[in-house]
Amino acid sequence: YHGCPSECTCSRASQVECTGARIVAVPTPLPWNAMSLQILNTHITELNESPFLNISALIALRIEKNELSRITPGAFRNLGSLRYLSLANNKLQVLPIGLFQGLDSLESLLLSSNQLLQIQPAHFSQCSNLKELQLHGNHLEYIPDGAFDHLVGLTKLNLGKNSLTHISPRVFQHLGNLQVLRLYENRLTDIPMGTFDGLVNLQELALQQNQIGLLSPGLFHNNHNLQRLYLSNNHISQLPPSVFMQLPQLNRLTLFGNSLKELSPGIFGPMPNLRELWLYDNHISSLPDNVFSNLRQLQVLILSRNQISFISPGAFNGLTELRELSLHTNALQDLDGNVFRMLANLQNISLQNNRLRQLPGNIFANVNGLMAIQLQNNQLENLPLGIFDHLGKLCELRLYDNPWRCDSDILPLRNWLLLNQPRLGTDTVPVCFSPANVRGQSLIIINVNVAVPSVHVPEVPSYPETPWYPDTPSYPDTTSVSSTTELTSPVEDYTDLTTIQVTDDRSVWGMTQAQSG
């Protein structure tokens, strides 16, 4: 194949791959017709002048996972056809000025996972056709104004996993075609107003895992095409009322792991495409009426691991498409009987690890499609008559780790549970807490030796096996609830996730912390 170096493999498709620790310099001679060259996992420490001079047809060049620490400015001379250049996973600290001169066709430049300390405007001034620039995983502390001014065609810029402490509001101003901007895992404490104003075509903005405390009110007002906004794991303590008002295309918003104390009504406004909203691990203490009312298509709402002690009856107004609601690991003691009334499509509700002492009998009255209710680890002593009667699709009900009071009043619930044992799962059954003489005994098989008040035990059990639909159900107003359903965390397209199933109050829908990469 026009002379393939012994350390390399060459294919008929003009692809050359050179790998191995024994390689200490660019192998020669390389086939003149090579279009793709990969130099991987070698001990090459430097690139000298023009090592690729005779392979001018090269389109893709990958020099990755080597010991490369020094490159001569003319190393890539004569590669005018090169479209893809990766120098990722090396040991570069400095890029020589003019290194990319003459690479007029270059569209993708990957410099990630090196040790670059700085970049300068002159580095990329010749790369006018560049569409993708990957600089994540370096040691950049600042980006000088003008660094990207010539990259007017750039669509993807990754600056994540660096040491950026601030961003100039002018640094992105000429990137009108940019669709993806990633700044995750830096040390940004605030983003100046106007920083993203020129990014009119931006679709994804990743700001997670920084130290951002405040968001300017108009920070995203020019980003009408934004679809994915990642703000998780920052120090955001409040959201300006208008900060999300101009984001009609948004379909993914992550705010978990911040310091949000409150959410004002309409804060998430109009986002007709938003399907998931992740707000776990904040300090939210209450939910006012209509706080999510603009999110008409929302299907997943995660509010677990906050400090929510009060939910206004109209807090979930507008969420007619919601399927999953996670409220576990909060400080809920009571719930209004109408709080879930609007959630006609709800399938899973997670209320475990709260302080619920009672539940209103009508709490699930309009939520006929519920499939999973997690109420474990609350302070429930009993549940109202008929609370689950109409839930024909209910297949998972978790009631363990509550202080069930096994007196005569528990019989209707006990009888219903007897008939519906499969729904409770096999691992853990609810046990009695009081009276003390039956403590620890299974609620399902408990023998209640007390006379049963006739008012509570009609001839047909109040918790029938076959769901029934009373025309006008009357529910006594008592009891409480808490749940967890397994789901995965927000999957960012460059995120590594592990899912585990746990009952620990530190889990979020059985999810470990997302690690962005």
Epitope: A331, Q333, D334, Q352, N353, R355, R357, Q358, Q376, N377, Q379, Y400, D401, P403, D427, T428, P430, V431, F433, S434, A436, R439, G440, Q441, T478, T503, D504, D505, R506
Partner: antibody
């Protein structure tokens, strides 16, 4: 007879971790919850967390990131794992349960405690 | 978190006299629907583990002498030892379980 016996205390280096055990007898861990409480010398009581009969856990929010409570029902043992120890974690560590009391978070049976000293 | 503040820090009372310990919570411990205050009192004698005396603010644990009584509601609570005995020398702690438990700082009761 109901008994709770703590073990695993001793001298730990700052930054290290500890794993304390609470061996229970006279009752089943599938029926009763077990709490962990600590007390620095001459100081007050501090609730650390609880593992309930079904395995759910609750933790003191100030310590939650460093604590894990687990159990092995068959071995009648409850464990407290604590990481990133500092001098302020030096204390007597107790496990306790709610055997007779009507108070769900009441602790009416206690172990004798095990001493943990964090020092270099 | 709910903060529990006890007063006084220490108390010296003659044998047979009344001892009164106060406990104040940073928020109400009353669950109005259950009509219960989620407050308990513990006694810890020197070198011993704590002992539960009173729960739900005023319900004595079985076996606890009736000279011990609890009162109060909402945020203000009191433990009273109507006639102090020598064996009552101890540190007394209040504990809330309205939210996840927190203890007061303790009150040391001694004989005058």
């Amino acid at each position: 007879e109901v008994q709770l016996v703590e073990s695993g205390g001793g001298l730990v280096q700052p930054g290290g971790s500890l794993r304390l055990s609470c061996a229970v007898s006279g009752f089943s861990l599938t029926s009763y919850g077990v709490h962990w409480v600590r007390q620095a010398t001459g100081k007050g009581l501090e609730w650390l967390g609880v593992i309930w009969a079904g395995g759910s856990t609750n933790y003191n929010s100030a310590l939650m990131s460093r604590l894990t409570i687990s159990k092995e029902n068959a071995k009648s043992s409850v464990y407290l794992q604590m990481n990133s120890l500092r001098a302020g974690d030096t204390a007597m560590y107790y496990c306790a349960t709610h055997m007779i009391t009507e108070d769900y978070y009441g602790m009416d049976y206690w172990g004798q405690g095990t001493t943990v000293t964090v020092s270099s | 978190d709910i903060v529990m503040t006890q007063s006084p820090d220490s108390l010296a009372v003659s044998l047979g006299e009344r001892a009164t310990i106060n406990c104040k919570s940073s928020q109400s411990l009353l669950n109005s629907r259950h009509r219960k205050n989620y407050l308990a009192w513990y006694q810890q004698k020197p070198g011993q583990s704590p002992k539960l005396l009173i729960y739900w603010a005023s319900t004595r644990e079985s076996g606890v002498p009736d000279r011990f009584s609890g009162s109060g509601s909402g945020t203000d609570f009191t433990l009273t030892i109507s006639s102090l005995q020598a064996e009552d020398v101890a540190v007394y702690y209040c504990k809330q379980s309205y939210n996840l438990p927190t203890f007061g700082g303790g009150t040391k009761v001694e004989i005058k």
